[in-house]
């Protein structure tokens, strides 16, 4: 490593604001709830309710707290070490492939299908075919979801569109 010279401008952003307590980094890293100063000499606390950091880090800034959207409820507020936890309101859910918004759960299953799973904040109601126990999506259900078919009726996937 080349020897380094450091020169500090006294800009307001570099001075510790009253609410931003400082401590020294450990092996170049600051603990959760802090970020590092530009010169790497200080750990500056995140601002409660505004930003946070969850891990030991050498980042110049804390991460901005998530604001729950309308249609979401706040399960736990943002702290200096943990982001806000938001959850879809009752009757709505968030899909993995479209996590940006809460969607309304279906009110019932299509004809010929039976409900085996309720609406939760992370999943729609789950429907299986009355006869075969096949999920509405066409997937073969897990063992605990299987609907017992009557004797002599082979369990085969049914093709349902929609």
């Amino acid at each position: 490593e080349s020897a380094l010279i450091t020169q500090q401008d006294l800009a307001p952003q570099q001075r510790a604001a009253p609410q931003q307590k400082r401590s020294s980094p450990s092996e170049g890293l600051c603990p959760p709830g802090h970020h590092i100063s530009e010169d790497g000499r200080d750990c500056i606390s995140c601002k409660y309710g505004q930003d946070y950091s969850t891990h030991w880090n050498d980042l110049l800034f804390c991460l901005r707290c998530t604001r729950c959207d309308s249609g979401e409820v706040e399960l736990s507020p943002c702290t200096t070490t943990r982001n806000t936890v938001c959850q879809c309101e009752e009757g709505t859910f968030r899909e993995e492939d479209s996590p940006e918004m809460c969607r309304k759960c279906r009110t019932g299953c299509p004809r010929g299908m039976v409900k085996v799973g309720d609406c939760t904040p992370w999943s729609d109601i789950e429907c299986v075919h009355k006869e075969s126990g096949t999920k509405h999506s066409g997937e073969v259900p897990a063992v605990e979801e299987t609907v017992t078919s009557s004797p002599g009726t082979p369990a085969s996937p049914c093709s349902l569109s929609g």
Epitope: Q7, Q8, D9, Q13, Q14, H35, I36, D39, L59, F61
Partner: nanobody, 123 residues
Framework: EVQLLESGGGEVQPGGSLRLSCAAS????????MSWFRQAPGKEREFVSA????????YYAESVKGRFTISRDNAKNTLYLQMSSLRAEDTAVYYC????????????????WGQGTQVTVKP
């Protein structure tokens, strides 16, 4: 998308001067450091100088101290390196880089790099 575009390189005689520029776009971080690194043929990329956008903290490698000056224009989002008293050993490709880490003088702490501009010092 972060983009860095260096300019100002060229050929100069020993003792001469050059001013490098690095125009940055797509930077939306609350604070970041911008640096100059250089790489001579057959050698590893080495740190030259850094400046932090928010507080203005500045770093120089010992080898360029007193000869090179780093500066920034916040309004233009542009980084500069004024190089004077140039020597043959300053010959290299000069790269502009951006980090969101503190006290960053190692290449691995940088996530964004420009394409580089050639500086050649010869009689």
């Amino acid at each position: 998308e972060v983009q860095l575009l260096e300019s100002g390189g060229g050929e100069v005689q020993p003792g001469g001067s050059l001013r490098l520029s690095c125009a940055a776009s797509g930077l939306t971080f609350p604070n970041y450091g911008m640096s100059w690194f250089r790489q001579a043929p057959g050698k590893e990329r080495e740190f030259v100088s850094a400046i932090y956008w928010s507080g203005g903290t500045v770093y120089y490698a010992e080898s360029v101290k007193g000869r090179f000056t780093i500066s920034r224009d916040n309004a233009k989002n542009t980084l500069y390196l004024q190089m004077s008293s140039l020597r043959a050993e300053d010959t290299a490709v000069y790269y502009c880089a951006v980090t969101i880490r503190g006290a960053a003088t190692q290449t691995w702490k940088y996530d964004y790099w420009g394409q580089g501009t050639q500086v050649t010092v010869k009689p």
